[in-house]
C-alpha cells in the first residue's frame, strides 16, 4: 500500500485536454495521459484547470452506464440484425449485405472495445498495464476503433452508390442473392479499413509515467518515427475529412445524381409499370439516408470538439480553463454520441423499415423463419417474397424483380 508519486510523461508533449481523459471511448483516440499535468518541452509542470476533474468525475459514471447500455443494446441489436440477414435467404441481397457488414463492424467494436473502455473508466488505468497482454490490448483497442468506424463510413458510401446504381440501371433485374460485385465491395471495405487503421496499431504503445513517484503505464499515441509524427499532427484533420466528411459528401453526390435520374425518367412508360418497385426503392433509399443522417448526428459533436481544440484552444493561455471546460464537456457528449452509433443502426432499421421491424419482432421472440403464420413481407431490395415456416427455399419471386446492386 505504498503511496504513489507525481507525474512525468516521457519526452512527450502532454496537453491538459483529453478525452475521458483517458476515456477515449470513440475511435478518435488521442494521446492518453494524466490530464492534470501539462508537461511542455521545457519539462516544467503547469497548473491544472480544476474544472476538468469535476467533469471527468461526473462523466466517469455517466459513461459507464451509457457504455454498459450500448454494450447490451449493440450486442443484441447487431447480432439480431446479422442473424436476420443470415437466416433468411430472402434478405440476402446487395443492400442488406452492406448493412450486415455495417452491423458486424459495430458488433466487433461493441464486444471488444467497450469492455476495455469500461475497465479503464472504473479502474483509472489500462487493463493488464504491466504485462504483454496489456501491450497487445493497447494496439488492438485503437486499431479496432479505427477499423470499425472505417467499416461504417465505407459501407455507408457503398450503400449510397448502391442506391444510385439501383435507380440508374432500374430496367435491369436481379433475383435474390448477394451480387459478386457487392461481395467484392464488402471484402475491399474491410481490407481498406484494416489498412487505414494500421498507423494506430503502430503508434499506440504503453508509455511509462510517474505520478508522485510511482511508475504507471498508460496506452497512448507516441510518435517515434517521422511518419508517425506527421500522422499525429494531421490526425484530427484526417479523421474529420475521411471518417466524417467523406461519407456525407459521397451520400450528397450520389443522392443528388439519384434524384436527377428519377426526375429525368419521370414520364417514362416503364416507370409506370414498375411504380411499385420505385416506391420500394425510395423506401430503401430513405432507409440508407436515415443511416447516414444518424451517423452525421452521432459523430459531429466529437469531430467539432476536436477541430475546435486543434484550432482555438491554446494550452499556454492563462484564460484557457473556461474554453477547456466547454471543450471537455463537448468531448464527453461527443464520445457518448459517437459510441451510440455502434448500437443505433439496428434500432433505426427497426423504425424505418417495416421488413426489418417484422423480422426483429419475430427473431427476438423466436426467429424469423419460425413464425407460425404465413408471412408476406417486402425485403429491402423491394422484391416481394412469400415463405412458409419450414420451406425457406420455396421463393415465389415477383417477375418484375429488379436490380439493387450490380451483378
Amino acid at each position: 500500500d505504498n503511496p504513489e508519486r507525481y507525474s512525468t510523461n516521457l519526452s512527450n508533449h502532454v496537453d491538459d485536454f483529453t478525452t475521458f481523459r483517458g476515456t477515449e471511448l470513440s475511435f478518435l483516440v488521442t494521446t492518453h495521459q494524466p490530464t492534470n499535468l501539462v508537461l511542455p518541452s521545457n519539462g516544467s509542470m503547469h497548473n491544472y484547470c480544476p474544472q476538468q476533474t469535476k467533469i471527468t468525475s461526473a462523466f466517469k459514471y455517466i459513461n459507464t452506464v451509457i457504455s454498459c447500455t450500448i454494450f447490451i443494446v449493440g450486442m443484441v441489436g447487431n447480432a439480431t440484425l446479422l442473424r436476420i440477414i443470415y437466416q433468411n435467404k430472402c434478405m440476402r441481397n446487395g443492400p442488406n449485405a452492406l448493412i450486415a457488414s455495417l452491423a458486424l463492424g459495430d458488433l466487433i467494436y461493441v464486444v471488444i472495445d467497450l469492455p476495455i473502455n469500461v475497465f479503464k473508466l472504473l479502474a483509472g488505468r489500462w487493463p493488464f498495464d504491466h504485462n504483454d497482454f496489456g501491450v497487445f490490448l493497447c494496439k488492438l483497442f485503437p486499431f479496432l476503433q479505427k477499423s470499425s468506424v472505417g467499416i461504417t463510413v465505407l459501407n455507408l458510401c457503398a450503400l449510397s452508390v448502391d442506391r444510385y446504381r439501383a435507380v440508374a440501371s432500374w430496367s435491369r433485374v436481379q433475383g435474390i442473392g448477394i451480387p459478386l460485385v457487392t461481395a467484392i465491395e464488402i471484402v475491399s471495405i474491410w481490407i481498406l479499413s484494416f489498412i487505414l487503421a494500421i498507423p494506430e496499431a503502430i503508434g499506440f504503445v504503453m508509455v511509462p509515467f510517474e505520478y508522485r513517484g510511482e511508475q504507471h503505464k498508460t496506452c497512448m499515441l507516441n510518435a517515434t518515427s517521422k511518419f508517425m509524427e506527421f500522422y499525429q499532427d494531421v490526425k484530427d484533420w484526417w479523421l474529420f475529412g475521411f471518417y466524417f466528411c467523406m461519407p456525407l459528401v459521397c451520400t450528397a453526390i450520389f443522392y443528388t445524381l439519384m434524384t436527377c435520374e428519377m426526375l429525368n425518367r419521370r414520364n417514362g412508360s416503364l416507370r409506370i409499370a414498375l411504380s411499385e418497385h420505385l416506391k420500394q426503392r425510395r423506401e430503401v433509399a430513405k432507409t440508407v439516408f436515415c443511416l447516414v443522417v444518424i451517423f452525421a448526428l452521432c459523430w459531429f459533436p466529437l469531430h467539432l470538439s476536436r477541430i475546435l481544440k486543434k484550432t482555438v484552444y491554446n494550452e499556454m493561455d492563462k484564460n484557457r480553463c473556461e474554453l477547456l471546460s466547454f471543450l471537455l464537456l463537448m468531448d464527453y457528449i461527443g464520445i457518448n454520441l459517437a459510441t451510440m452509433n455502434s448500437c443505433i443502426n439496428p434500432i433505426a432499421l427497426y423504425f424505418v423499415s417495416k421488413k426489418f421491424k417484422n423480422c426483429f419482432q419475430s427473431c427476438l421472440c423466436c426467429c424469423c423463419y419460425q413464425s407460425k403464420s404465413l408471412m408476406t413481407s417486402v425485403p429491402m431490395n423491394g422484391t416481394s417474397i412469400q415463405w412458409k415456416n419450414h420451406d425457406q427455399n420455396n421463393h415465389n419471386t415477383d417477375r418484375s424483380s429488379h436490380k439493387d446492386s450490380m451483378n
Epitope: N2, P3, E4, R5, Y6, S7, T8, T18, R21, G22, P34, T35, N36, L37, L39, G43, S44, M45, H46, N47, Y48, P50, Q51, T53, K54, T56, S57, K60, L122, A123, G124, R125, E210, Y211, R212, G213, E214, H216
Partner: antibody, heavy 115, light 112 residues
C-alpha cells in the same frame, strides 16, 4: 532509517541569492520524487517546488516561479533549491520531503531569513 | 488553484475524547489514475510535519489506529477516536491530486 538533512539556510538581503541543500540517506534516492515545502511564521505550509525521480520535470509555486530552481544530484543523494531575487515574503523554514504518493518523510528544516 | 478549507482553526479537547477535523476542497480531488491524493500531516511543537494519512484513508506505517481518514470528492475528515497527549499539535490537510498542490490552513489540537 530514512534521513533528510537540510543545510545552507541563513540571513540574506532582499534581492540576494542562496542555495539550500538536502542530503538524503537510508533509501534509494533516485527512485523517489522530492519536494521543498516552506513554513512561514504564521505556521502556513506551502509547497515551493517539486522534482521527479530523474530531475527531468519540475514544478514551482506561482510565488517563486522564475526565481527558484529545484535540482537534484542522484549520484550524491542530494536535493538543491537555488533561490535568487529573494524577498521578505520568502522568509520561512524550508523543509525537504520525500514524495511517494505522499510526503512520507521530512527533514528537520533550515531557516531562511530575508532582511 | 485548489483551495483546502480546514475547520475548525482551533480544537480544544479533553484527553480520551474524540476529535474530528474537516477539510473541504474547492474542486474534486480524484486524479485520472483513480486515486484521490488527500493527506493529513501532524506537526508537533518544535518538530517538522509528519505524515499520518495518505490517499484519503490509508494510515502511514507507525500511525496508531485511533487515526482515521475518510471522505471523497471534495469533503474529507480526520477523526481521532481517543485523544492522547502525544496527539497535540497542528493538523494539516493536503491535496496532491492537482497542481498546484495545496495545504489547508491547519487545525490546532489543544487541551481544554
Amino acid at each position: 532509517d530514512v534521513h533528510l538533512v537540510e543545510s545552507g539556510g541563513g540571513l540574506v538581503q532582499p534581492g540576494g541569492s542562496l542555495t539550500v541543500s538536502c542530503a538524503a540517506s537510508g533509501f534509494t534516492f533516485s527512485t523517489y520524487g522530492m519536494s521543498w515545502v516552506r513554513q512561514t511564521r504564521d505556521k502556513r505550509l506551502e509547497l515551493v517546488a517539486t522534482i521527479n525521480t530523474n530531475g527531468g520535470n519540475t514544478y514551482y509555486s506561482d510565488n517563486v516561479k522564475g526565481r527558484f530552481t529545484i535540482s537534484r544530484d542522484n549520484a550524491k543523494n542530494t536535493l538543491y533549491l537555488e533561490m535568487r531575487g529573494l524577498r521578505s515574503g520568502d522568509t520561512a523554514m524550508y523543509y525537504c520531503a520525500r514524495d511517494y504518493g505522499a510526503m512520507d518523510y521530512w527533514g528537520q528544516g533550515t531557516s531562511v531569513t530575508v532582511s | 488553484e485548489v483551495v483546502m478549507t480546514q475547520t475548525p482553526l482551533s480544537l480544544p479537547v479533553s484527553l480520551g475524547d474524540q476529535a474530528s477535523i474537516s477539510c473541504r476542497s474547492s474542486h474534486y480531488l480524484v486524479h485520472d489514475n483513480g486515486n484521490t491524493y488527500v493527506e493529513w500531516y501532524l506537526q508537533k511543537p518544535g518538530q517538522s510535519p509528519k505524515l499520518l494519512i495518505y490517499k484519503v484513508s490509508n494510515r502511514f506505517s507507525g500511525v496508531p489506529d485511533r487515526f482515521t481518514g475518510s471522505g471523497s470528492g471534495t469533503d474529507f475528515t480526520l477523526k481521532i477516536s481517543r485523544v492522547e497527549s502525544e496527539d497535540l499539535g497542528i493538523y494539516y490537510c493536503f491535496q496532491g491530486s492537482h497542481f498546484p498542490f495545496t495545504f489547508g490552513s491547519g487545525t490546532e489540537l489543544e487541551i481544554k
